[in-house]
Interface confidence: low
């Protein structure tokens, strides 16, 4: 054997070296890699040193029998079926209150014929739950509401008013109170006919002000 080179490096089971036929002179670097489903145990990089010995012991390739840690998810806690995540292990993510889960809550570590075991899905996320809007309320009979929308965002206020001759019973303004779900601060008001005396008084004032034979008046009455 030559005395100016490092010893020949063998192939390793379930892996390979590159370059496959290295020069064995001082300074040569050889990298060992493992086939899918196996991981390097020991140092994957060996260097031929001044003294013509390799810098590290020969590594080996060991079968991967577990999934990597899928990690914590912000704003959640997780329940782990077994430490080190072997095949068959599950991780369940439970979002903190006020946060909503997006994705799969339970991940399972599956074996694969070729390659390392893999989680059944990506880790989910827990996002701040959006405050839901309040559904629009009908305008009271003989009255109106503003704004006239189907949905009102949390924090919004709607205002009610009544037609002439009617008075508001209840709150003139009510608010969409933020929450899970959001809700109206008060029930919608109603519009009641004013007392009969007051009703006719208001009408006689209208008549006094109105032009003769007004079609508007006819329509109003």
């Amino acid at each position: 054997p030559r005395n100016d080179t490092c010893p020949e490096l063998p192939e390793i089971p379930n892996g390979w070296k590159s370059p496959s036929q290295p020069e064995l002179v001082h300074g040569t670097v050889v990298t060992y890699q493992c086939y899918p489903g196996y991981q390097v145990v020991g140092s994957s990089v060996l260097m031929c040193q001044w003294d013509l010995t390799w810098s590290e012991d020969l590594p080996s390739c060991q079968r991967v029998t577990s999934c990597h840690d899928p990690g914590d998810v912000e704003h959640s806690r997780r329940l782990i079926s077994s430490p080190k995540f072997p095949v068959g292990a599950t991780v369940q993510y439970i979002c903190d209150q006020g946060f909503v889960l997006m994705g799969s809550s339970i991940l399972t570590c599956h074996d694969r014929q070729a390659g390392s075991p893999k989680w059944s899905d990506r880790a989910p996320k827990c996002l701040l739950e959006q405050l839901k809007p309040c559904h629009g309320l009908s305008a009271p009979e003989n009255g109106a509401r503003s704004p006239e929308k189907q949905l009102h965002p949390a924090g919004a206020t709607i205002h009610f008013s009544c037609a002439p001759g009617y008075v508001l019973k209840g709150q003139a303004s009510i608010k969409c109170v933020p929450g899970h779900p959001s809700h109206w601060s008060d029930p919608p008001p109603i519009c009641r006919a004013a007392s009969l005396d007051g009703f006719y008084n208001s009408r006689s004032l209208d008549v006094a002000k109105a032009p003769a034979a007004s079609s508007t008046l006819d329509a109003a009455h």
Partner: antibody, heavy 122, light 111 residues
Framework: QVTLKESGPGILQPSQTLSLTCSFS??????????VGWIRQPSGKGLEWLAH???????YYNTALKSRLTISKDTSNNQVFLKIANVDTADTATYYC??????????????WGQGTLVTVSA | DLVLTQSPASLAVSLGQRATISCRAS??????????MHWYQQKPGQPPKLLIY???NLESGVPARFSGSGSGTDFTLNIHPVEEEDATTYYC?????????FGGGTKLEIK
């Protein structure tokens, strides 16, 4: 394990309506943030996104084809459907369904079916 | 529609060397701290496989020799060191707005 599988008629004639079904398992389309989309690929050519549907029934279509496309879902049977009206030979392609996840963004298509080949021929 | 232009259309790289594939968008695909660009690998007769999502995030189970970078309109997929099994076609895709579009593809060959 997330899996998706497309099925279709194989061959149909011009002007007919193409009906495709994507049957999936390993996830539910009522889960917040989950969507399923359709992508097609003519033989030897690139990929074209067609449509997708989200967990909340929001539907989105490729504008160039919108008038011909209808996407729908059957959550209880874990299926998504795509109909393409008035097909032409240019619609000959492999049709894929794929799952995506909406976090605080639209993610990539992380899981794909194997595809189903559809040929439009007179 | 937002157009994605991939370059080169094909490239040949020696085993163990670096392959660099570029994807240029006709307008920015970055907003709110995210770049909505994704990279796929597609082998003949198979569906595409997600490699990189949101420009630089490695999809679970994808080897670390794949990496993505870029923001705005210019994005890059790097493969280093290239292995025999990497010889296939790669696509970029954006999800910044509708309609989603894919790049025209880049075919990687091993010398």
């Amino acid at each position: 394990q997330v899996t998706l599988k497309e099925s279709g008629p194989g061959i149909l004639q011009p002007s007919q309506t193409l009906s495709l079904t994507c049957s999936f398992s390993g996830f539910s389309l009522i889960t917040y943030g989950i969507g399923v989309g359709w992508i097609r690929q003519p033989s030897g050519k690139g990929l074209e996104w067609l449509a997708h549907i989200w967990w909340n029934d929001n539907k989105y279509y490729n504008t160039a084809l919108k008038s011909r496309l209808t996407i729908s879902k059957d959550t209880s049977n874990n299926q998504v459907f795509l109909k393409i009206a008035n097909v032409d030979t240019a619609d000959t392609a492999t049709y894929y369904c794929a799952r995506m996840v909406y976090y605080d963004y639209d993610g990539g298509f992380a899981y794909w079916g194997q595809g189903t080949l559809v040929t439009v021929s007179a | 529609d937002l157009v994605l232009t991939q370059s080169p259309a094909s490239l040949a790289v020696s085993l163990g060397q670096r392959a660099t594939i570029s994807c240029r968008a006709s307008e920015s695909v970055s907003t709110s701290g995210y770049s909505y660009m994704h990279w796929y690998q597609q082998k003949p007769g198979q569906p595409p496989k997600l490699l990189i999502y949101l420009a630089s995030n490695l999809e679970s189970g994808v080897p670390a020799r794949f990496s993505g970078s870029g923001s705005g309109t210019d994005f890059t997929l790097n493969i280093h060191p290239v292995e025999e099994e990497d010889a296939t076609t790669y696509y970029c895709q954006h999800s910044r707005e509708l309609p989603y579009t894919f790049g025209g593809g880049t075919k990687l060959e091993i010398k």
